[in-house]
């Protein structure tokens, strides 16, 4: 079965996030997907989201982040830009299907930005997690003002029996430091 | 450590499927997205798609759409690539590989690849 | 899609000599490059990540550069057991496409 799980991030200012969700090809290729923010005890807030309906491979950018959907491979990849600490939390994708609520997608996103400047000459860190170039044609998509009561914040069990971390060989220096935590089987 | 192990070498005529089975061990095998790559003999690296093994969801590149699926048993961490309608130009070394990061990273670095299937397509 | 132009197709060199291979994307592609390298009957091994960062286990003499367009890949010291063919690969959006390879001898 499907588990729900979250991915741990962390980053330092100034980086990226770049992130995909996967969806259903032959049901949601051309819905409105979009980018949400979840913080504790509250309903999730949509910072970004596609046009209606989306179109295939053209970045629509809000502000820092930038979406992109890829409907022949069933893709969405999410970029936030010059991450601030105030951007950390724990974030979704979702796909709006009027009049339905909307569907989440796996996995969430835990999102921690520290303080620190990341693009020191010959560091090891990937430097071009710093500097994204802006598409040409970005678009500000209209997102539906709804979100979904059933996606309030639900913290992960107490018992680490599921947990499971990066192998041990897997060197990503700094860019994508992820831990796997399952939030519910 | 992580292993991809492939199923043996394959003959078929044209207009038949081959199924492709890799089976993953050293890891949690619902954590990480695999990609299908093929080689045809002396010939370069083509990406087929890729497969999320946690949602089942997968993708592949528009040539191999209407002929490819690509499935998993997550009972035995078994990842399966079936290609239809089977042509000479099938014929190749078909790999199963494992990404750098998890599933949700945008990293398609191919890190861990199993030891490969020889498909032949012949009349 | 994306076109990654390798160049040279073959070369020979000797032990000890530094090798330079190029790889051009036909698009800015920021640093999501990848080079691999693929020995005989072998399956491919993935040297460097991102352009620049070394697999872990990979000798310190391969190092990889460059961003945007034109990207570089070098051996500081030839060894006899790099010959293979090696492979760049990008992943700046999809689909993800592999150069048609530069494949290395020894002279």
């Known amino acids: 079965a499907t588990k729900l799980t979250e991915e741990k991030y962390e980053l330092k200012e100034g980086q990226t996030l770049d992130v995909k969700c996967d969806y259903t090809l032959e049901k949601f290729a051309s819905s409105q997907k979009a980018w949400q923010i979840i913080r504790d005890g509250e309903m999730p807030k949509t910072l970004a989201c596609t046009e209606r309906p989306s179109k295939n491979s053209h970045p629509v950018q809000v502000g820092r982040i930038i979406l992109e959907d890829y409907h022949d491979h069933g893709l969405l990849r999410v970029r936030m830009v010059n991450l601030q600490v105030e951007d950390s939390g724990l974030y979704q994708c979702v796909i709006y299907q009027p009049p339905k609520e909307p569907h989440m997608l796996f996995d969430r996103i835990r999102l921690v930005v520290t303080k620190g400047f990341s693009g020191t000459p010959g560091s090891n860190e990937n430097s071009t997690q710093n500097v994204y170039k802006i598409p040409p044609t970005t678009t500000k998509a209209l997102c539906p003002l709804y979100t979904s009561p059933r996606t309030v914040t639900q913290a992960p069990p107490k018992s680490t029996a599921d947990v499971s971390t990066p192998d041990s060989e897997i060197n990503l220096t700094n860019v994508t430091d992820i831990i796997r935590v399952p939030v519910f089987n | 450590q992580v292993q991809l192990v492939q199923s043996g070498a394959e003959v078929k005529k044209p207009g038949a499927s081959v199924k492709v089975s890799c089976k993953a061990s050293g890891y949690t095998f619902t954590s990480y997205d695999i990609n299908w790559v093929r080689q045809a003999t002396g010939q370069g690296l083509e990406w087929m798609g890729w497969?999320?093994?946690?949602?089942?969801?997968?993708g592949s590149v528009k040539k191999f759409r209407d002929r490819v699926t690509m499935t998993r048993d997550t009972s035995i961490s078994t990842a399966y690539m079936e290609l239809s309608s089977l042509r000479s130009e099938d014929t190749a070394v078909y790999y199963c590989v494992r990404l750098i990061g998890y599933s949700s990273a945008w990293k398609w670095s191919f890190q861990h690849w199993g030891q490969g299937t020889l498909v032949t397509v012949s009349s | 899609d994306i076109q990654m132009t390798q160049s040279p197709s073959s070369l020979s060199a000797s032990v000890g000599d530094r090798v330079t291979i190029t790889c051009q994307a036909s698009r800015d592609i920021s640093k999501y490059l990848n080079w691999y390298q693929q020995k005989p009957g072998k399956a491919p091994k993935l040297l460097i990540y991102?352009?620049?960062n070394l697999e872990t286990g990979v000798p310190s003499r391969f190092s990889g550069s460059g961003s945007g367009t034109d990207f570089t890949f070098t051996i500081s010291s030839l060894q006899p057991e790099d010959i293979a063919t090696y492979y760049c690969?990008?992943?700046?959006?999809?689909?993800?496409?592999f150069g048609q390879g530069t494949r290395l001898e020894i002279k």
């Open positions: 991102d352009a620049s």
């Open positions: 497969m999320n093994p946690n949602s089942g969801n997968s």
């Open positions: 690969q990008h992943y700046d959006n999809i689909p993800i496409t």
